[in-house]
Interface confidence: low
């Protein structure tokens, strides 16, 4: 999905009002310096691409974040403010339903959510210069 045509300001507002708080809740009990940020993004469409990937794609050691509160709110924001996004997610959602598992917060998931926090912060500062 190409995130170029999303309403970035509306997504930013959704992040600031609620998603950011859910991410902090998920990370409660971990130090802010515990994980190094190894994922970055260069502009807002790129940031949303990476946010979607880390939020909804299963990875080794962290099977699924998609049922977390921040993920459901992220999905809702993208569906509302990115034209055509919800249609592209139908197949992905059906696949998710088939492999729903017991929720376990692993260290790998905490690391992944830490990366997500960094991506969201970058999304909110699109004019920062990057090497």
């Amino acid at each position: 999905y190409d995130f170029t045509n999303c309403d970035f300001e509306k997504i930013k507002a959704a992040y600031l009002s609620t998603i950011s708080k859910d991410l902090i809740t998920y990370m409660s009990g971990t130090k802010s310096t515990e994980f190094n940020n190894t994922v970055s993004c260069s502009n807002r469409p790129h940031c949303l691409t990476e946010i979607q990937s880390l939020t909804f794609n299963p990875t080794a050691g962290c099977a699924s974040l998609a049922k977390e509160m921040f993920a459901m709110k992220t999905k809702a924001a993208l569906a509302i403010w990115c034209p055509g996004y919800s249609e592209t997610q139908i197949n992905a959602t059906q696949a998710m339903k088939k492999r729903r598992k017991r929720k376990v917060t692993t260290n790998k998931c905490l690391e992944q959510v830490s990366q997500l926090q960094g991506l969201w912060r970058r999304f909110n500062r699109p004019l920062l210069k990057q090497q």
């Epitope: 190409d2 170029t4 994980f35 190094n36 190894t38 994922v39 970055s40 993004c41 260069s42 502009n43 469409p45 790129h46 691409t49 990476e50 990937s53 880390l54 794609n57 990875t59 080794a60 050691g61 690391e111 992944q112 990366q115 990057q130 090497q131």
Partner: antibody
Framework: EVQLVESGGGLVQPGGSLRLSCSVS????????VNWVRQAPGKGLEWLGA???????NYHSALISRLTISKDNSKSTVYLQMNSLRAEDTAVYYC????????????WGQGTLVTVSS | EIVLTQSPGTLSLSPGERATLSCSAS???????LHWYQQKPGQAPRLLIY???NLASGVPDRFSGSGSGTDFTLTISRLEPEDFAVYYC?????????FGQGTKLEIK
């Protein structure tokens, strides 16, 4: 069919500059990024930088002062400008198309050889 | 900057044998950002495996990838003559990309 074709390589004097072109087909530069990667003779791959659909760029931190990546969407061409060339810049220069904004390079050009020598 | 170190530098095996190539990252990586390429002399690199374990289009299923954190592996279950080449691991989320130094797989 996605294709990338590099051109502009050749012999360059030390201290000189190069401007390479990457002509693309099968996709639009308005929406897709292109990366540059080089390979010195007998050596490994080195990422140089990227230009994205919206025109934003990223560069290898060690080369940022000597490197400029630009594009002309209407000509479906991406350019790599590199200044103050030295012998160690001798390499085959490739352009590559990433999958979306990822670092997954599924499509590569054939490469163009740049030799820096007096 | 994340540094990728590949081992061994050269691997000498015979057709039919199993090859195991390693890639170690200087700090922990999401498995979404680790990819493998094959390169033969005089050719551009070819994408083999993306996001740690997914086979690229047209790649035979004797190739597989695994790993997490800092340690990743490319395995070729049964070597064919055309598999002898240089293999590179690569990391990056599209910016600040780095490659390993490569592993040369040669015929014993």
């Amino acid at each position: 069919e996605v294709q990338l074709v590099e051109s502009g390589g050749g012999l360059v004097q030390p201290g000189g500059s190069l401007r390479l072109s990457c002509s693309v087909s099968g996709f639009s530069l308005t929406y897709s990024g292109v990366n540059w990667v080089r390979q010195a003779p007998g050596k490994g791959l080195e990422w140089l930088g990227a230009i994205w659909g919206d025109g934003s760029t990223n560069y290898h931190s060690a080369l940022i002062s000597r490197l400029t990546i630009s594009k002309d969407n209407s000509k479906s061409t991406v350019y790599l400008q590199m200044n103050s060339l030295r012998a160690e810049d001798t390499a085959v220069y490739y352009c590559a198309k990433p999958d979306g904004y990822s670092g997954i390079f599924a499509y590569w050009g054939q490469g163009t050889l740049v030799t820096v020598s007096s | 900057e994340i540094v990728l170190t590949q081992s061994p530098g050269t691997l000498s095996l015979s057709p039919g044998e199993r090859a195991t190539l390693s890639c170690s990252a200087s700090s922990s990586l999401s498995s979404n950002y680790l990819h493998w390429y094959q390169q033969k002399p005089g050719q551009a690199p070819r994408l083999l495996i993306y996001r740690t374990s997914n086979l690229a289009s047209g790649v035979p299923d004797r190739f597989s990838g695994s790993g997490s954190g800092t340690d990743f592996t490319l395995t070729i279950s049964r070597l064919e003559p055309e598999d002898f080449a240089v293999y590179y691991c690569q990391q990056g989320s599209g910016i600040l990309v780095t490659f390993g130094q490569g592993t040369k797989l040669e015929i014993k």
